[in-house]
């Protein structure tokens, strides 16, 4: 009778993390008389995956009743296959022998490959926001992925960027990679609405890629543009100074008015307007009492927005056309473009 | 084509640490053994151990307790430390790839370094 | 640890004559699966070793068909069917069935 052959029909298998992975194996003769044993790798270093004879394998089943006495069919099936698992695994008879079994015949091997999913791509923007004009940085990162080949893309509201490095680690073997890439991105005035996106594509994924994303409303600053002027006057003695401020972004603003440098009043804008691009647009204004004034005015707007140095414009409010009215201590009336009344 | 590196100081002092690294180019650490191999002046090869990919390590029993060997897969290099050393570890030191596909034993080891000069001297 | 004992010790050559070297194992290198785990190098002068034979007699790829092995269980024999200028160097043989892996002293071939 010819000699006992180990045959492993499938010289490597691909499954996909998560999944189960059948190794097949199958003996030519029931002689001679001996157990299966499976081993991940070759030589002394091998690990024992399965053994017919003896030992808990909660992770694997065999394919066919190895207790039937005809049975030659010595596959596996290794359950929840993580990168981890990845190798050459060996069908290994021995043959019965006192007090040990002995190592009779291999199998040639199969290489065991595992593909797993990157995880969703996450993308970060600067800590701290940026004005128009200047080069900000994303990073774009995910992990988890195998084998290593993957293709990583920027968008900036759907046009490709080319700006951008990417790494994938380790750069030597691993049972699974992760990928980090970091885009350069110019601001824009109308970026408020933009958004910058990081394609992940992957075997893996069968065509259909991850997609993270970030708003550059999260990473923009706007500074606001003022104009004051002079609104005719409301009363005899009366004059009505508006402080427009436009195209800021992000809402958070304080302004404050000035008479001739001291501080008159301070608000902060809530009812604002919102413009086509995202920017606002706000209006305060001063209700000035000139006969309280022997000289000439200089009202300033200043304005504090998201935390910056104030910016400030100024407007110099004639009073000598005007007549005084001796006694009175009102310099300006507080109204602002949410507080109408005059009190 | 694999490709193997030796790197390290050529010169370690008596009592001091002999610490080398061998670099992996051109291939799959996995499914191999990453071996240590030392031939004093004018002498024969001596085995000093190896590292299987799964990080099981084999050491020869008359160097093991001063042997240390790693595998970083990540950056494609194996490294050898040995402690306390002495004017007898004077030896070219080889870095070698021994392959394994059937059974317990080794299938020849295919791939090594050119060798690198390490001189313990005071 | 298994003793691997070489001869000769040194072997002067004809250029185009054979060769034959000899490597015996302190124990036997024949595993219960039929393999002999024995293999053959040639260390070239100035060179690192370079693997010539594995499994007492499985050719290394890229070895010319002038070298063969032979043997089993605890004698083998390195073959060189007609002897070249490029062979000159050490051979070794070494154990592959156990660790520790050990070496044969080496046969130094020289042209006469």
């Known amino acids: 009778e010819e000699e006992l052959q180990v045959i492993q029909p499938d010289k490597s298998v691909l499954v996909a993390a998560g999944e189960t992975a059948t190794l097949r194996c199958t003996a030519t003769s029931l002689i001679p008389v001996g157990p299966i044993q499976w081993f991940r790798g070759a030589g002394p270093g091998r690990e024992l995956i399965y053994n017919q004879k003896e030992g808990h394998f909660p992770r694997v089943t065999t394919v066919s009743d190895l207790t039937k006495r005809n049975n030659m069919d010595f596959s596996i099936r290794i359950g929840n296959i993580t990168p981890a698992d990845a190798g050459t695994y060996y069908c290994v008879k021995f043959r019965k022998g006192s007090p040990d079994d002995v190592e009779f015949k291999s199998g040639a091997g199969t290489e065991l490959s595992v593909r797993a999913k990157p995880s969703a791509p996450v993308v970060s923007g600067p800590a701290a926001r940026a004005t128009p004009q200047h080069t900000v940085s994303f990073t774009c990162e995910s992990h988890g992925f195998s084998p290593r080949d993957i293709t990583l893309k920027w968008f900036k509201n759907g046009n490709e960027l080319s700006d951008f490095q990417t790494n994938v680690d380790p750069v030597g073997e691993s049972v699974s990679y992760s990928i980090h890439s970091t885009a350069k991105v110019v601001l824009t005035r109308e970026d408020v609405h933009s958004q910058v996106i990081c394609e992940v594509a992957h075997v893996t994924l069968q065509g259909d890629p991850l997609r993270g994303t970030a708003n550059l409303s999260e990473t923009i600053r706007v500074p606001p543009t003022l104009e004051v002027t002079q609104q005719p006057v409301r009363a005899e003695n009366q004059v009505n100074v508006t402080c427009q401020v436009r195209k800021f972004y992000p809402q958070r603003l304080q302004l404050t008015w000035l008479e001739n440098g001291n501080v008159s009043r301070t608000e902060t804008a809530s009812t604002v307007t919102e413009n086509k691009d995202g920017t606002y647009n706000w209006m305060s204004w001063l209700l000035v009492n000139v006969s309280a004034h022997r000289d000439d005015v200089k009202l300033t707007c200043q304005v504090e927005h998201d935390g910056q140095p104030a910016v400030s414009k100024s407007h110099d409010l004639k009073v000598s056309a005007h007549p005084k009215e001796q006694g009175s201590n009102t310099a300006a009336e507080n109204t602002g473009s949410n507080e109408r009344n005059i009190y | 084509q694999v490709q193997l590196q030796e790197s390290g100081p050529g010169l370690v002092r008596p009592s001091e640490t002999l610490s080398l690294t061998c670099t992996v180019s051109g291939g799959s650490i996995r499914n191999y053994y990453w071996s240590w191999i030392r031939q004093p002046p004018g002498k024969g090869l001596e085995w000093i151990g190896f590292?299987?990919?799964?990080?099981?390590?084999f050491y020869n029993p008359s160097l093991k307790s001063r042997v240390t060997i790693s595998l970083d897969m990540s950056i494609n290099q194996f490294s050898l430390k040995m402690t306390s050393v002495t004017a007898a570890d004077t030896a070219v030191y080889y870095c070698?790839?021994?392959?394994?596909?059937?059974?317990?034993?080794?299938?020849?080891?295919?791939?090594w370094g050119q060798g690198t000069t390490v001189t313990v001297s005071s | 640890d298994i003793v691997m004992t070489q001869s000769p010790l040194s072997l002067p050559v004809t250029p185009g004559e054979p060769a034959s070297i000899s490597c015996k194992s302190s124990q036997s290198l024949l595993y219960s699966n039929g393999y002999a785990y024995l293999d053959w190098y040639l260390q070239r002068p100035g060179q690192s070793p370079q693997l010539l034979i594995y499994?007492?007699?499985n050719r290394a790829s890229g070895v010319p068909d002038r070298f063969s092995g032979s043997g089993s269980g605890t004698d083998f024999t390195l073959k060189i069917s007609r002897v070249e200028a490029e062979d000159v160097g050490v051979f070794y043989c070494?154990?592959?069935?156990?660790?520790?892996?050990?070496f044969g002293g080496g046969t130094k071939v020289e042209i006469k």
């Open positions: 070698a790839r021994v392959r394994a596909y059937s059974g317990i034993g080794l299938d020849g080891t295919d791939v």
């Open positions: 070494m154990q592959a069935l156990q660790t520790p892996l050990t």
């Open positions: 499994q007492g007699s």
């Open positions: 590292i299987y990919y799964n990080g099981r390590t």
